[in-house]
Interface confidence: medium
C-alpha cells in the first residue's frame, strides 16, 4: 500500500505530494477517502488539487484525514494515500515528537541542516532558522538556499532546529514551519561499556514508611555523542511503566557532561508515600548501550527509629 504520512500546523500552508509517481502528462485525481468526495482543482478553494500536489492554503485541523490520489495513464491507474494530520499550534516552545521530521547528524566537517519538505513550496530566500525556538544569530550560522550551515560545530549545537519560510500562491503569502533534530557526532568520541556511578551494587537504601524516597541511577557511556545509550529503573525485573504502581515513577535527570568530557545520564526513581510492600521489591538500575547492559540492584530497608536521635 503506497501511503505517506504528512503533517502540518493550522493556519500554515501544507502541500502534500501523491506517494504514487507518474509522468507530468498523467492526470492525477484526488479524493477525500472518508467521503470519496473529489478534491476540486480550482485555486479559489482553500484546499485544492494541483496535479501530483494537494494544497492546503492554509490548513485547518478539520482537514485531517486520509486522501486518495489516483494517477491515471492511458494504460494503468496507480493509487496512493496521503495520511494528513493538522495540529493546533503549540502555545509553548516545545515541539512534540509528532511534528518532528527525521533527525540529521552533523560533525565538524559537515553541518548542513536541510529544511524539510521545502522543495514542495514556492518560496524565496532567505529562510529563517530557529533553535529551540530562539532565532539564530551570529556569524557561525549561515542560511544558504534551502539549508543551514553551522561553522565550528560543537556538541552544544545539538537540538531542535526550525526553518520558517513563506509560500506564495497567486500573490497570497502563507507561512510554513518545519522542525527536525540535529545531533552532533564527536569525531574524537568513543563509547565504552556503561559505568554505573550510583547506586553501588547491592546498596541498601534506608527509607521511612509514609515518606517520599528518591533513588538515582547515574551512568556514563563514553565521550561524545552516544548511540542508544539509556539508564532506566526496573522493579522486580519489570519496566516501571508496566509495573503499574502510580506511586513509583521514573524521571529523567539532567544530561551531564563532566569536566573530563564523559557523557553521562541520570534517571531518578521517585517513590511517593513509601509502604511496607515497597521494602519487598528489587530495584534495578540499568545502564545500557551498544556494548551491553550493566545492572546494579538496590533494596530498601526501614530506617531504624533510633536514627532519628542521632
Amino acid at each position: 500500500k503506497f501511503s505517506k504520512q504528512s503533517w502540518g500546523l493550522e493556519n500554515e500552508a501544507l502541500i502534500v505530494r501523491c506517494p504514487r509517481q507518474g509522468k507530468p502528462s498523467y492526470t492525477v485525481d484526488w479524493y477525500y477517502s472518508q467521503t470519496n468526495k473529489s478534491i476540486p482543482t480550482q485555486e479559489r478553494n482553500r484546499v485544492f488539487a494541483s496535479g501530483q500536489l494537494l494544497k492546503f492554503l492554509p490548513a485547518a485541523v478539520a482537514d485531517s484525514g486520509i486522501y486518495t490520489c489516483i494517477v491515471r495513464s492511458p494504460t494503468f491507474n496507480r493509487t496512493g494515500y496521503a495520511n494528513v494530520t493538522i495540529y493546533k499550534k503549540q502555545s509553548d516552545c516545545n515541539v512534540p515528537d509528532y511534528l518532528m521530521y527525521s533527525t540529521v547528524s552533523g560533525s565538524e566537517k559537515n553541518s548542513k541542516i536541510y529544511c524539510p519538505t521545502i522543495d514542495l513550496y514556492n518560496w524565496t530566500a532567505p529562510l529563517e532558522w530557529f533553535k529551540n525556538c530562539q532565532a539564530l544569530q551570529g556569524s557561525r550560522y549561515r542560511a544558504h538556499k534551502s539549508f543551514l550551515v553551522i561553522d565550528n560545530v560543537m556538541t552544544e549545537d545539538a537540538g531542535d532546529y526550525t526553518c520558517k519560510f513563506i509560500h506564495n500562491e497567486n500573490g497570497a503569502n502563507y507561512s510554513v514551519t518545519a522542525t527536525r533534530s540535529f545531533t552532533v557526532k564527536d569525531e574524537q568520541g568513543f563509547s565504552l561499556f556503561p559505568v554505573i556511578g550510583a547506586p553501588a551494587q547491592n546498596e541498601i537504601k534506608e527509607v521511612e514508611i509514609g515518606k517520599n524516597a528518591n533513588l538515582t541511577c547515574s551512568a556514563c557511556f563514553g565521550k561524545g555523542t552516544q548511540f542508544l545509550a539509556a539508564v532506566l529503573w526496573q522493579l522486580n525485573g519489570t519496566k516501571i511503566t508496566d509495573f503499574g504502581e502510580p506511586r513509583i515513577q521514573q524521571e529523567e535527570g539532567q544530561n551531564q557532561s563532566f569536566s573530563n568530557g564523559l557523557a553521562c545520564l541520570d534517571m531518578v526513581l521517585r517513590i511517593a508515600d513509601v509502604k511496607e510492600e515497597d521494602l519487598l521489591l528489587q530495584y534495578d538500575c540499568l545502564a545500557l548501550n551498544l556494548h551491553g547492559l550493566r545492572r546494579h540492584t538496590v533494596r530498601l530497608s526501614r530506617k531504624n527509629p533510633i536514627d532519628h536521635h542521632s
Partner: nanobody
C-alpha cells in the same frame, strides 16, 4: 510513546537463517538509532547490532559480525535483522530497541521480544 513489535523469530537448524522485523508506531521513527539486543536464559541482555536511521552507520557485536546484517526502512517505520549461519549459542529472546542520544530528548524504548531457537 513509541510502540515496538518484533516478529520473525522461531525454531531454526544450525547454519540456517532468520529475518527479524521490528515495526515502530506511535511516534517519530527517524530517531537517532534502532538496535537489537538479546537475552539468553540465565544471562544478561547483550547488544547485537544497531543502525542510525538518520545516517545509516551500523554497529555489530563481535560475536555476530559477518553473519548478521541490520537495516532500516524509514518509509515503513521498520528495522530488520537478517541472521545467517545461525549457531546454537544464538538462541535467545531478541529485543528491538529504539532511542535517541544523550543530546536528544527522545526516550529509549524496547519491545516485548521474539524468541529465536537454534537447535537440530
Amino acid at each position: 510513546e513509541v510502540q515496538l513489535v518484533e516478529s520473525g523469530g522461531g525454531l531454526v537448524q544450525p547454519g540456517g537463517s532468520l529475518r527479524l522485523s521490528c515495526a515502530a508506531s506511535g511516534g517519530t521513527f527517524s530517531v537517532y538509532a534502532m538496535g537489537w539486543f538479546r537475552q539468553a536464559p540465565g544471562k544478561e541482555r547483550e547488544a547485537v547490532a544497531s543502525i542510525s536511521t538518520s545516517g545509516g552507520s551500523t554497529y555489530y557485536a563481535d560475536s555476530v559480525k559477518g553473519r548478521f546484517t541490520i537495516s532500516a526502512d524509514n518509509s515503513k517505520n521498520t528495522a530488520y535483522l537478517q541472521m545467517n549461519s545461525l549457531k546454537p549459542e544464538d538462541t535467545a529472546v531478541y529485543y528491538c530497541a529504539i532511542g535517541g542520544t544523550l543530546y536528544d530528548r527522545r526516550r529509549f524504548e524496547w519491545g516485548q521480544g521474539t524468541l529465536v531457537t537454534v537447535s537440530s
